[in-house]
Amino acid sequence: TIDTKRNISAEEGGSVILQCHFSSDTAEVTQVDWKQQDQLLAIYSVDLGWHVASVFSDRVVPGPSLGLTFQSLTMNDTGEYFCTYHTYPGGIYKGRIFLKVQESS
């Protein structure tokens, strides 16, 4: 199963950690996809390492663990984020996070 904070908030110009936790006694994680709506943010592959989409490469840092640190947030970053865990032999598991970027006080 995937466990995640469903709703998170952060300040404009700040950073936030996007984190999904996968728990299984038998399945091994082989790949994790991170998307902002339908746009690819980053992919982690156990065989290749991290690939960060070029459009986000200056603002997205892999980690901690299989999560992402999203930096220099703008109001336009408000929205849904999805993690997709590819596991063997367990199949595919998805998680959803809603990020609200608030104006800095």
């Epitope: 592959s45 156990v46 065989d47 290749l48 390492g49 991290w50 690939h51 960060v52 892999p62």
Partner: antibody, heavy 119, light 107 residues
């Protein structure tokens, strides 16, 4: 024994195309990611591209993105590198290589095939 | 992309010497670093993966250490067959990248 044999290199003019092949044997090719790495004469190693076991998950070095295409035919145990719009700086010895699963090191290499881009 | 800087670019040593080669990454790469040996006219040979794990069949005089940004390859007692060029390679981020190489020459 595990073996990789590259072919298809040669002399080609700038702007032209070439397709490299890599014949694999001695291991379960269809279960392995495969990489291309190149080495310009007298220079160091440069990673070029990788392809997933099933032909998905293709990634490229910035220097070849949009010009080179990596592909594979698992029924023939063969890896390919289609090189278009070749430039003088693509002149190199091209190696195919197999990684250690999950370890991200390249443990089996071919002998290489030389590509020379010159007018 | 991650830049890997190897030092020194060349080293002269004698049989029996202890040789140390360093590799510094422009960003943290955890322990995802491999080391290769290449002899003239030959393909590279994997020595170390995961910064410190010895590849099967590689002599125990080769060892690797480090994590984050700073890594070391050590040859404890240089043998005649060890004169070659050594490369580090990171595999934390795509694209994978190699260091510029260190040539180990006979003094």
């Amino acid at each position: 024994q595990v073996q990789l044999v590259e072919s298809g290199g040669g002399v080609v003019q700038p702007g032209r195309s070439l397709r490299l092949s890599c014949a694999a044997s001695g291991f379960t090719f269809s279960s392995s990611y495969m990489h291309w790495v190149r080495q310009a004469p007298g220079k160091g190693l440069e990673w070029v591209a990788v392809i997933g076991a099933d032909g998905s998950n293709k990634y490229y070095a910035d220097s070849v993105e949009g010009r080179f295409t990596i592909s594979r035919d698992n029924s023939k145990n063969t890896l390919y590198l289609q090189m278009n719009s070749l430039r003088a700086e693509d002149t190199a010895l091209y190696y195919c290589a197999k990684p250690v699963p999950r370890r991200r090191g390249l443990d089996v290499w071919g002998q290489g095939t030389m590509v020379t881009v010159s007018s | 992309d991650i830049q890997l800087t190897q030092s020194p670019s060349s080293v002269s040593a004698s049989v029996g010497d202890r040789v140390t080669i360093t590799c510094r990454a422009s960003q943290g790469i955890s322990s995802w670093l491999a080391w290769y040996q290449q002899k003239p006219g030959k393909a590279p040979k994997l020595l170390i993966y995961g910064a410190s794990s010895l590849q099967s069949g590689v002599p125990s005089r080769f060892s690797g250490s480090g994590s984050g940004t700073d890594f070391t390859l050590t040859i404890s007692s240089l043998q005649p067959e060890d004169f070659a060029t050594y490369y580090c390679q990171q595999a934390f981020y795509l694209p994978w990248t190699f260091g510029g190489g260190t040539k180990v020459e006979i003094k």
